[in-house]
């Protein structure tokens, strides 16, 4: 279904696993706990998903919806740039940056934000459902 | 009840490998990541790494990255770590681990501990 | 790495004392401190988890705080069943790391 590739479009698939959310065609995970950016985004690999990459501005306005002042990364870096990690570049919204060494995207409910990647924040992970259940 | 079963002491010449293993009862075994967990006699605990047993999706400490490799086997809801290149600091108690509640690395049930006694 | 520092190796101590722990990391891990207990030749156990959540079926008598990088583990009424090594372990960051653990002795 939607296991070959993690930034897939992601239509009619079935429901989410546990603690995941079912929001249009994919799931989310808002975490509870805490971590660095590198270790958020091992987290959502080893359940066969991603850090939050956000396609638009609808998307983006959608999710802000469950958030709060707390800052969730997401995956998204700035590397020459800020793109997401599929590799397209942020096109849709501003990131707010204090310094040349935030170089990792978060989220609250007011937009996005840079941060310094070794912070402990929430994290929000994003996949595609999948037709066999398991708690991941 | 929730239980990790693991294989008993193991006594491995230097330079030899050895592979140790976990068996899983009381839960559904594809749902929580199997840790793995070393400690030298009288000391600490260093996390070697985990395994997902739904996808076999493996995450090591760099500074176990050549030395363990850990697997699988789905039908019989059993983990291994692999040990290879044996020196006596790989002499230590083995432990599996898992959180039970499956997003959390706070390790609620271990495994009894397996010896690996690494001599000439 | 995150390093996580146990500066106590051993801590002597008599039933009915108060007793704090203390473990400090090398850098932020906000609350994602746990803590276990074990005794010779067993497994360790549960004790603590995000820096001041009891697991289930822990005496009250254990109490985790702290946050950022200083966490303390604290017994309120020692009592011998309690004598045991103690390490604190950070799920911030991987790979997990722990302290090196502190033993609890009797006076």
């Known amino acids: 279904l939607c296991q070959g590739s993690n930034y897939s479009t992601c239509a009619s698939c079935p429901s989410c696993p546990d603690r995941w959310m079912k929001y249009g065609n994919h799931c989310y995970y808002f975490s509870v706990e805490e971590k660095d950016w590198n270790s958020s985004l091992e987290f959502c690999l080893a359940r066969d998903s991603h850090l939050l990459v956000i396609t638009d501005n609808q998307e983006m306005s959608l999710l802000q919806v469950f958030l709060s002042e707390a800052f969730c990364w997401i995956g998204l870096r700035n590397n020459s740039g800020w793109r997401w990690e599929d590799g397209s570049p942020l096109n849709f919204s501003r990131i707010s940056s204090n310094s040349f060494v935030q170089t990792c995207g978060a989220i609250n409910k007011n937009g996005l934000q840079a941060s310094s990647c070794e912070v402990p924040l929430h994290w929000v992970c994003k996949k595609c459902p999948f037709a066999d259940q398991a708690l991941f | 009840q929730v239980q990790l079963q693991q294989s008993g002491a193991e006594l491995v010449r230097p330079g030899a490998s050895v592979k140790i293993s976990c068996k899983a009862f009381?839960?559904?075994?594809?749902?929580?990541?199997i840790n793995w967990v070393k400690q030298r006699p009288g000391q600490g605990l260093d996390w070697i790494g985990y395994i997902n047993p739904y996808n076999g999706y493996t995450n090591y400490n760099q500074k176990f990255k050549g030395k363990a490799t850990l697997t699988v086997d789905k039908s019989s809801s059993t983990a291994y770590m692999e040990l290879s290149s044996l020196t006596s600091e790989d002499s230590a108690v083995y432990y599996c681990?898992?959180?039970?509640?499956?997003?959390?690395?706070?390790?609620?049930?271990w495994g009894q501990g397996t010896l690996v006694t690494v001599s000439a | 790495d995150i390093v996580m520092t146990q500066s106590q190796k051993f801590m002597s101590t008599s039933v009915g004392d108060r007793v704090s722990i203390t473990c400090k990391a090398s850098q932020n891990v906000g609350s994602t401190v746990v803590w276990y207990q074990q005794k010779p030749g067993q497994s360790p156990k549960l004790l603590i988890y995000?820096?001041?959540n009891r697991y289930t079926g822990v005496p009250d008598r254990f109490t985790g705080n702290g946050s950022g990088t200083d966490f303390t583990l604290t017994i309120s009424n020692m009592q011998s069943e309690d004598l045991a090594d103690y390490f604190c372990q950070q799920c911030s960051s991987y790979p997990l790391t722990f302290g090196a653990g502190t033993k609890l002795e009797l006076k």
């Open positions: 995000s820096a001041s």
């Open positions: 009381g839960y559904t075994f594809t749902n929580h990541f």
């Open positions: 681990a898992i959180s039970y509640d499956g997003y959390y690395e706070r390790f609620a049930y």
